[in-house]
């Protein structure tokens, strides 16, 4: 049977290093990597292996490595971002942007630079909504249609269809009746008076509430580690 | 299979400044060093040092510091000697070699430094 | 550095008879359970070609006419038989700390 070889050796022509071993191109040799968290201290000779050591407070290392210095993690999160990944020895701190923000400027992870979602202000209604990653678009309420809030997430709904009308409706303010009832009203039980800006019409998607903890989806997937912890060697 | 292939051969005067290529193949370029080797006329092989190609860090044996420099183009997993201020007695082929221990060579590369 | 010494500087073999180049080393090349001299070839106006790594190690595509043995300070590469094709410089190379050294080479040719 072939014997195991122990890190340091050296490869056959035409071989690789083995999984988590790298290939050292001055002892010329396969090597251990260190593992993920800690970061090489030593690099191997002929005759000694890799040394590792851990990885210094606010620093980390994500992969197996051979890397002379763990990498810094990210300054702290800034007031219009959340921390949703604490930086320890084997991951960077993820800072992702609070609900109505998105990121203007995305980082490998997470997101350098946050901005408040645009809102649409009264006759304009939310056209395609924002997301992590992009702004809200507005577009002007047509015909038939108002938004009489500046929000970013109302969209443009209908007036209401009155029996007599009172105040046409424009893109800004709902149609008023003058009979006791409308013949449709969008939200059963509306008064039919112009709606108060808190108002909601039931077509408008609810926003979550302050305290609902970000989805999973919410966050922006891994991304490649640096360069300088890939492997070469296998 | 593993190749390295040389820029053909120069005929330079003395002062002047070469520059050789050697293009890798066969295999991921910035796994393995690159060490370069002289051979003059009528003498023995001598070894001028290496490059790491991973971190294009250069290391020159003793006789060879100076007017000599490595370098790479990793994205076209290429190696380069460069000899400034020519003289007479860099008269020589050059091989590139595959550091891996044992070397892989390249076919060589002929200088001719003459007035 | 580590000094090659290789013998003889010239060999004439007879074709069919065994041709041997030996290799000394001023120190020793080995480290980790290995010797770290290998043997090249060089025909006349050509580059190397890696003919033994690792002292004792054919590589891929040499005719097993060619081996190499020894430790530490003293390494033979032999040819048995040898062929009209053999003709040509060999060389040692160790590896074992930097710089590279090399031998200075055996001219074989064919009597």
């Known amino acids: 049977p072939a014997q195991v070889a122990f890190t340091p050796y050296a490869p056959e022509p035409g071989s690789t290093c083995r999984l988590r071993e790298y290939y050292d191109q001055t002892a010329q040799m396969c090597c251990s990597k260190c593992s993920p968290g800690q970061h090489a201290a030593v690099f191997c000779t002929k005759t000694s292996d890799t040394v590792c050591d851990s990885c210094e407070d606010s620093t980390y290392t994500q992969l197996w490595n051979w890397v002379p210095e763990c990498l810094s993690c990210g300054s702290r999160c800034s007031s219009d971002q959340v921390e949703t990944q604490a930086c320890t020895r084997e991951q960077n701190r993820i800072c992702t942007c609070r609900p109505g923000w998105y990121c203007a400027l995305s980082k490998q992870e997470g997101c350098r630079l946050c901005a408040p979602l645009r809102k649409c202000r009264p006759g304009f209604g939310v056209a395609r909504p924002g997301t992590e990653t992009s702004d809200v678009v507005c577009k002007p309420c047509a015909p038939g249609t108002f938004s009489n809030t500046t929000s970013s997430t109302d969209i443009c709904r209908p007036h209401q269809i009155c029996n007599v009308v009172a105040i046409p409706g424009n893109a800004s303010m709902d149609a008023v009746c003058t009979s006791t009832s409308p013949t449709r009203s969008m939200a059963p039980g509306a008064v039919h008076l112009p709606q108060p800006v808190s108002t909601r019409s039931q077509h408008t998607q609810p926003t979550p509430e302050p305290s609902t903890a970000p989805s999973t989806s919410f966050l922006l997937p891994m991304g490649p580690s640096p360069p300088a912890e890939g492997s070469t060697g296998d | 299979q593993i190749q390295l292939v040389q820029s053909g051969p120069e005929l330079k005067k003395p002062g002047e400044t070469v520059k050789i290529s050697c293009k890798a193949s066969g295999y991921t370029f910035t796994t393995f060093g690159m060490s370069w080797v002289k051979q003059a006329p009528g003498k023995g092989l001598k070894w001028m040092g290496w490059i790491n190609t991973y971190s294009g860090v250069p290391t020159y044996a003793d006789d060879f510091k100076g007017r000599f420099a490595f370098s790479l183009e990793t994205s076209a997993s290429t190696a380069y000697l460069q000899i400034n201020n020519l003289k007479n007695e860099d008269t020589a082929t050059y091989f590139c070699?595959?550091?891996?221990?044992?070397?892989?060579w390249g076919q060589g590369t002929l200088v001719t430094v003459s007035a | 550095d580590i000094v090659l010494t290789q013998s003889p500087a010239s060999l004439a073999v007879s074709l069919g008879q065994r041709a041997t180049i030996s290799c000394r080393a001023s120190?020793?090349?080995?480290?980790?359970?290995?010797?770290?001299m290998h043997w090249y070839q060089q025909k006349a106006g050509q580059s190397f070609k890696l003919l033994i790594y690792?002292?004792?190690n054919l590589e891929s595509g040499i005719p097993a006419r060619f081996s190499g043995s020894g430790s530490r300070t003293d390494f033979t590469l032999t040819i048995n038989p040898v062929e009209a094709d053999d003709v040509a410089t060999y060389y040692c190379?160790?590896?074992?700390?930097?710089?590279?050294?090399f031998g200075g080479g055996t001219k074989l040719e064919i009597k």
């Open positions: 120190e020793s090349v080995d480290s980790s359970g290995n010797s770290f």
């Open positions: 070699a595959r550091r891996s221990n044992f070397a892989y």
């Open positions: 690792r002292a004792s």
């Open positions: 190379q160790q590896s074992n700390e930097d710089p590279w050294t």
